[in-house]
Interface confidence: low
């Protein structure tokens, strides 16, 4: 029998698999590269014509704990002269990331895996102009 | 959700670190945002660092797809349309989590895993190395 | 499969312009690309242009000079290209690929066509 997964694609479902209670799904959450580390240009944050700063988000509930989320610190981006062109646009660039939500219903406990929207810099862009007839 | 009954004490014994491994729902809260970043957005052609997104499919992943964006030029853009080689276009790296199939081929075992992607790319100022 | 066939390859003074033509059948495709080879050298991007026609990409070396564009049957590419330098002289190929990404990469084509050549000279 195939077992569809996630998103469609169909797998032979091997013998080995551990059985799971219907509904649900085993995780593990012994994060394979878990010392991986983030080769970024040096403080691109801060050298970039559209800059940002970062804010760590803390909860207790959620795995991994820790979430850190940009914010661009202008409107317009920054010209060669330094200083802010507003002609121009710095926009927050996003991207999507798992974490784990515990929730407590009474003396009970339950996990639920959660997309989480990150924005993890941003860019400078021409803006889009709408003319209005 | 999958609920795991606490200990008799619950009220007092509340464990401050997640277990190693545990059942989850299947169903993934905020699932159907919008995963396309050439659907949800044009930044990617109008930015003066503009990238193209390259598609990174695995069956033993969820998601089994991700964009990868790669820088199209080393400069930037300049207000002329010109490549302004003055700056610098680099990826904006970050580390997200997915999940592994474990073992492979499992519909629903998983194992967190950590990878880096590059999200788009930012235009900035060049480190200049003067050599003495 | 898809068939590819180009045409409108010819002898053009520095300063011309040239027109060329892909036309496809078979199957359908993401994106389209021009790539050129001169030679002894590398074959290299060009343009390309998605299965949707909405979006394009062209090397910087080309960038201002040369249009690429589809018909509204989406089976003929087009390369108008204008301002033609000699270093432009080489093999021009239609490819086709799947994905819009990492579009330069001659190796991601999967599809050629046989080329055709344009030489830019005085």
């Known amino acids: 029998r195939k077992i569809p997964k996630v998103g469609h694609t169909f797998f032979q479902k091997p013998e080995s698999c551990p059985p799971v209670p219907g509904g649900s799904m085993k995780l593990d959450i012994g994060i394979i590269n878990e010392n991986q580390r983030v080769s970024m240009s040096r403080n691109i944050e801060s050298r970039s014509t559209s800059p940002w700063n970062y804010t760590v988000t803390w909860d207790p509930n959620r795995y991994p704990s820790e979430v850190v989320q940009a914010q661009c610190r202008n409107l317009g981006c920054i010209n060669a002269q330094g200083k802010e062109d507003i002609s121009m646009n710095s926009v927050p660039i996003q991207q999507e990331t798992l974490v784990v939500r515990r929730k407590h219903q009474g003396c009970s406990v339950s996990f639920q895996l959660e997309k989480v929207l990150v924005t993890v810099g941003c860019t400078c862009v021409t803006p889009v102009i709408h003319h209005v007839q | 959700g999958i609920t795991i009954p606490r200990n008799p004490g619950c009220p007092n014994s509340e464990d401050k670190n997640f277990p190693r491994t545990v059942m989850v729902n299947l169903n993934i809260h905020n699932r159907n945002t919008n995963t396309n970043p050439k659907r949800s957005s044009d930044y990617y052609n109008r930015s003066t660092s503009p990238w193209n997104l390259h598609r990174n499919e695995d069956p033993e992943r969820y998601p089994s797809v991700i964009w990868e964006a790669k820088c199209r030029h080393l400069g930037c853009i300049n207000a002329d349309g010109n490549v302004d080689y003055h700056m610098n276009s680099v990826p904006i790296q970050q580390e997200i989590l997915v999940l592994r199939r474990e073992p492979p081929h499992c519909p629903n075992s998983f194992r967190l895993e950590k990878i880096l992607v590059s999200v788009g790319c930012t235009c900035v100022t060049p480190i200049v190395h003067h050599v003495a | 499969e898809v068939q590819l066939v180009e045409s409108g390859g010819g002898l053009v003074q520095p300063g011309g312009s040239l027109r060329l033509s892909c036309a496809a059948s078979g199957r359908t495709y993401d994106a389209m690309g021009w790539l050129r080879q001169a030679p002894g050298k590398e074959r290299e991007f060009v343009a390309a242009i998605s299965g949707s026609g909405d979006d394009t990409y062209y090397a910087d070396s080309v960038k201002g000079r040369f249009t690429i564009s589809k018909d509204n049957s989406g089976n003929t590419m087009y390369l108008q290209m204008n301002s033609l330098r000699p270093e432009d002289t080489a093999v021009y190929y239609c490819?086709?690929?799947?994905?819009?990404?990492?579009?330069?990469?001659?190796?991601?084509?999967?599809?050629w066509g046989q080329g055709t050549l344009v030489t830019v000279s005085s």
């Open positions: 490819a086709t690929r799947r994905g819009l990404y990492y579009v330069w990469d001659s190796n991601d084509y999967e599809n």
